[in-house]
């Protein structure tokens, strides 16, 4: 049994880090493998993560972490029984993938303006809470070419757009994702999408 693709990990900078790797053949990850992780910290103790299958030869492990600070560094040991298959380390602050925003809502009752709001996925005491920026994706269910991205570079989790920038009388969907420049993170996953029917009063043409 050998590791074909070494573990790579990302942290949500809160409580979970996710590590994925591939073995050289079909593996029952949960029964055959264990990933031990330990904070490099005086008198800390190792914790065990039981991996799950992620495709035939792929494994994934969700490491539970008691908060994250920038100095954190973990040693990782991948074991198959008594055999050490791989040894490495992981610094969560250098491999951050933020949590996805939630509760995306489209408010259509604001005089020809669409107000999109969503929730910051972090509590106020988390470092990322005040460092997230967002991308909002809006697309038409009827026209695949009608697809747009709005970058929200301010901290408030909301976006206002004129309803008239979208076509009237058709349905649209929106979703939002987040990233944090301070840790050069990857983008989060997209939030679940939300749907609304776009309608607004066309302005009277003046002759």
């Amino acid at each position: 049994m050998k590791v074909l693709q070494e573990p790579t990990c990302v942290s949500d900078y809160m409580s979970i880090s996710t590590c994925e790797w591939k073995m050289n053949g079909p593996t029952n990850c949960s029964t055959e493998l264990r990933l031990l992780y330990q904070l490099v910290f005086l008198l800390s103790e190792a914790h065990t993560c039981i991996p799950e299958n992620n495709g035939g030869a792929g494994c994934v492990c969700h490491l539970l972490m008691d908060d994250v600070v920038s100095a954190d560094n973990y040693t990782l040991d991948l074991w198959a029984g008594q055999q050490l298959l791989w040894k490495g380390s992981f610094k969560p602050s250098e491999h951050v993938k933020p949590r996805a925003p939630g509760n995306l809502t489209v408010h259509t009752n604001v005089s020809d303006t669409l107000l999109l709001t969503w929730s910051n996925p972090y509590p106020p005491d988390n470092y990322l809470y005040n460092h997230l920026t967002y991308a909002v994706n809006i697309w038409s269910e009827n026209d695949p070419a009608d697809f747009r991205i709005y970058n929200v570079t301010y901290l408030e989790p909301s976006l206002r757009i004129a309803a008239s920038t979208l076509k009237s009388g058709i349905s649209y969907r929106a979703r939002v994702r987040a990233w944090a420049q301070c840790y050069n993170t990857t983008w989060s996953e997209w939030s679940p999408s939300t749907k609304w029917h776009n309608s607004y009063r066309e302005p009277f043409e003046q002759h």
Partner: antibody
Framework: EVQLLESGGGLVQPGGSLRLSCAAS????????MHWVRQAPGKGLEYVSG????????YYANSVKGRFTISRDNPKNTLFLQMSSLRAEDTAVYYC?????????????WGQGTTVTVSS | EIVLTQSPGTLSLSPGERATLSCRAS???????LAWYQQKPGQAPRLLIY???RRATGIPDRFSGSGSGTDFTLTISRLEPEDFAVYYC?????????FGQGTKLEIK
């Protein structure tokens, strides 16, 4: 209420021994690494020793290495510091301290301290 | 072993003023954890800040920590009468724990 209560301090002659105890209440000792920190009269804080939550790993400051032994009895929620070959410079208030991993080495619960005096 | 040097040794200020206490490490401490404690006469120390900048439970927001590498700072934005005490920085690493010698914050 989360509390640590030290006992066992007293007056001892140079070269003598003493065993300090620390009783924990309001939390489960076995979930935390525990430490001893001391403070000589009118001086600053000095780290002495620590022990991992399951007792499998210990650490000692160079000044006490080979003379002091830290141990714990998790079922009895008690931490110990066995001190031998005591010297005058070991005279101090000894604090029992809890380290919460979430606080990354921040010592969030301290006992009231027990005084050790080494003098002839 | 990393040595922590605090400055100034004594700081004399008045209530309402801003206090800035310094803690300097003898070598890079990026992979260790810096904490700050407050100690009043006859009492055990109290944890204020951990992980360089995070306030412990129940600590007022006038206390803040910052810094990186070798230079760390504890700031008290507006001194209250109960803030006059001795302050210690502490470094908790992978193989040692050390304290600074302390800064005494006294009423001017």
């Amino acid at each position: 209420e989360v509390q640590l209560l030290e006992s066992g301090g007293g007056l001892v002659q140079p070269g003598g021994s003493l065993r300090l105890s620390c009783a924990a209440s309001g939390f489960t000792l076995s979930s935390y690494a525990m430490h001893w920190v001391r403070q000589a009269p009118g001086k600053g804080l000095e780290y002495v020793s620590g022990i991992s939550s399951n007792g499998g790993s210990t650490y000692y400051a160079n000044s006490v290495k080979g003379r002091f032994t830290i141990s714990r009895d998790n079922p009895k929620n008690t931490l110990f510091l066995q001190m031998s070959s005591l010297r005058a410079e070991d005279t101090a208030v000894y604090y029992c301290v809890r380290v919460f991993v979430r606080y990354r080495g921040g010592m969030d619960v301290w006992g009231q301290g027990t005084t050790v005096t080494v003098s002839s | 072993e990393i040595v922590l040097t605090q400055s100034p040794g004594t700081l004399s200020l008045s209530p309402g003023e801003r206090a800035t206490l310094s803690c300097r490490a003898s070598q890079d401490a990026s992979n260790a954890y810096l904490a700050w404690y407050q100690q009043k006469p006859g009492q055990a120390p109290r944890l204020l800040i951990y992980g360089t900048s995070r306030r412990a439970t129940g600590i007022p927001d006038r206390f803040s920590g910052s810094g990186s590498g070798t230079d760390f700072t504890l700031t008290i934005s507006r001194l209250e009468p109960e803030d006059f005490a001795v302050y210690y920085c502490q470094l908790y690493g992978s193989s040692s724990v050390t304290f600074g010698q302390g800064t005494k914050l006294e009423i001017k």
